[in-house]
């Protein structure tokens, strides 16, 4: 806390300008009116205040707005935003996308801080859902943002917002997240033709069920191995050798390089060796010829 001391004669600030950088902490506290500061927040960024001086300015705003800053002040916080704690930010009501962008710009190039995470959380909760414009903005600043959300939070993403998602935005998503996003993507892209549809849906296929993979295998999509390796193992296992061959097209030869990685390894174990041999890739580990395959899951369903 800065002690309350009277402002020396002639030092009362009439506006926020460069002369204030020469003020000591106690002079800033005594001579800068909080209301003036609030109305001229946009000027603070252009003045090279020290961190200690910024602490004083923050203290003045905290006193003026104990219940939380108004959006008109928040939008112009600039580098003062870096002084805010998550507790400060929880008091805010940020509704403007422009305000959000302005504050994200301050933190640009850095990891998502607890302050930014709290700000985004407040903003999204205030909007009720993650709309396309918000998602566009957040993924532009933080490509991994989408994958930082829980499946429950992702369920509030409307299918229309999926158009804003780029492949790199999904790089760090796990299967549970893709399980939520895939049906939304399928709905969002449903009116596209075959090849265009595949280009858009490809990044989401880690959440696709077997029947959708079977359908894709009939469309000459030529899925690459990087995409195939991200598919759910339980979705890949029921595919036949012929279906995988159609799904991968010319990329089928890549199965050899990945034969010990999931899901390829588990899929190989489910295929007849003579079916695998038809690929001519030297894949080993299939069911030997002459062995009977019992589908126990089917047996359980019948009993």
């Amino acid at each position: 806390e800065v002690e309350k001391t009277a402002c020396p004669s002639g030092k009362k600030a009439r506006e926020i300008d460069e002369s204030l950088i020469f003020y000591k902490k106690w002079e800033l506290e005594a001579c800068v009116d909080a209301a003036l500061l609030a109305t001229q927040m946009d000027r603070v960024n252009a003045i090279p205040f020290t961190y200690e001086q910024l602490d004083v300015l923050k203290h003045k705003l905290d006193e003026l707005y104990p219940q939380g800053y108004p959006e008109s002040v928040i939008q112009h916080l600039g580098y003062l935003f870096l002084k805010m704690s998550p507790e400060d930010i929880r008091k805010w009501n940020v509704t403007s996308l422009e305000t959000l962008k302005a504050l994200l710009e301050v933190n640009k190039g850095h990891e998502m801080s607890p302050q930014v995470a709290t700000l985004i959380d407040r903003f999204v909760k205030g909007r009720g859902q993650l709309d396309k414009d918000t998602l566009d903005t957040l993924t532009a600043f933080y490509p991994g943002y989408l994958c930082s959300l829980s499946p429950e939070e992702l369920s509030s993403v409307p299918p229309s917002s999926i158009w804003a998602v780029r492949p790199q935005d999904l790089d760090t998503c796990d299967p549970r997240q893709l399980d939520v996003l895939y049906p939304k993507a399928r709905l969002a892209f449903q009116n596209m033709n075959g090849s265009e549809y595949f280009v858009k849906i490809q990044s989401f296929l880690g959440g696709a069920p077997t029947e959708d993979l079977k359908a894709l295998s009939q469309q000459n999509v030529s899925m690459d191995l990087a995409t195939f390796m991200k598919l759910r193992t339980d979705a890949v296992l029921p595919l036949t050798v012929a279906e995988v061959q159609k799904l991968l097209g010319p990329h089928v030869e890549g199965l050899k390089a990945e034969e010990r990685h999931r899901p390829v390894r588990d899929w190989i174990l489910r295929q007849r060796q003579d079916d695998l041999d038809t690929l001519g890739l030297g894949l080993q580990g299939g069911i030997p010829n002459g062995y009977l395959v019992l589908d126990l899951s089917m047996q359980e369903a019948l009993s």
Epitope: D171, A226, G254
Partner: antibody, heavy 119, light 108 residues
């Protein structure tokens, strides 16, 4: 420009562990496996294993099974190779090498990390 | 595991001469799964040829590869000063992946 940058040289005592990092840049990290290959002084190349950065799935050469652990951090596009219970014959240059998923050849290599095991 | 034996261990030639390097596998290797690397002293290996005969990006046309089954060859049609190095063959047809012991091409 595609680059694999490895951590610096290490000197370890027998029985200790070493963890080497390999930071990737200039390409889509999850489209390529990362393999580790070592080379003892004046010797040839020896494949140790690989990791799929997308799934975290690993395959290890049986020779190193139980001693080697490969991990990834997608947020920093970095892979790690940890080798435990070090012995003098583990003295070598350790390379990370990029391998496009679905191929078996290494098109980009790290600069190598020298690990010396000596009492 | 498949053992790759490279011969000769050392090849002494002059610039402009033709170099023929052999790689013999202990059991059959599918030709798509064999590649060659070049390594110079103090440097990392560099991919030269993949799938037995495909030239990697940026590799001059004087390098070529051939072979099938258990016998593979790397040929350098006319040696340049920068070609003097160690060459390794590598297979990923069978687990674990293995490299040959290397052939050193040195200046005569």
């Amino acid at each position: 420009e595609v680059q694999l940058v490895q951590s610096g040289a290490e000197v370890k005592k027998p029985g200790a562990s070493v963890k080497v990092s390999c930071k990737a840049s200039g390409y889509t990290f999850t489209d390529y496996n990362m393999d580790w290959v070592r080379q003892a002084p004046g010797q040839g190349l020896e494949w140790m294993g690989d990791i799929n950065p997308s799934t975290g799935g690993t395959i290890y050469n049986q020779k190193f099974q139980g001693r080697v652990t490969m991990t990834e951090d997608k947020s920093t596009s970095t892979v790690y190779m940890e080798l435990s219970s070090l012995r003098s014959e583990d003295t070598a240059v350790y390379y990370c090498a990029r391998r496009r998923i679905g191929t078996g050849y290494f098109d980009v290599w790290g600069q190598g990390t020298t690990v010396t095991v000596s009492s | 595991e498949i053992v790759l034996t490279q011969s000769p261990a050392t090849l002494s030639l002059s610039p402009g001469e033709r170099a023929t390097l052999s790689c013999s596998a202990s059991s059959s290797v599918i030709s798509s799964y064999l590649s060659w690397y070049q390594q110079k002293p103090g440097q990392s290996p560099r991919l030269l040829i993949y799938r037995t005969s495909n030239l990697a990006s940026g590799i001059p046309a004087r390098f070529s590869g051939s072979g099938s089954g258990t016998d593979y060859t790397l040929t350098i049609s006319s040696l340049e000063p920068e070609d003097f190095a160690v060459y390794y063959c590598h297979q990923w047809s069978s687990f674990p992946y293995t490299f040959g012991g290397g052939t050193k091409v040195e200046i005569k």
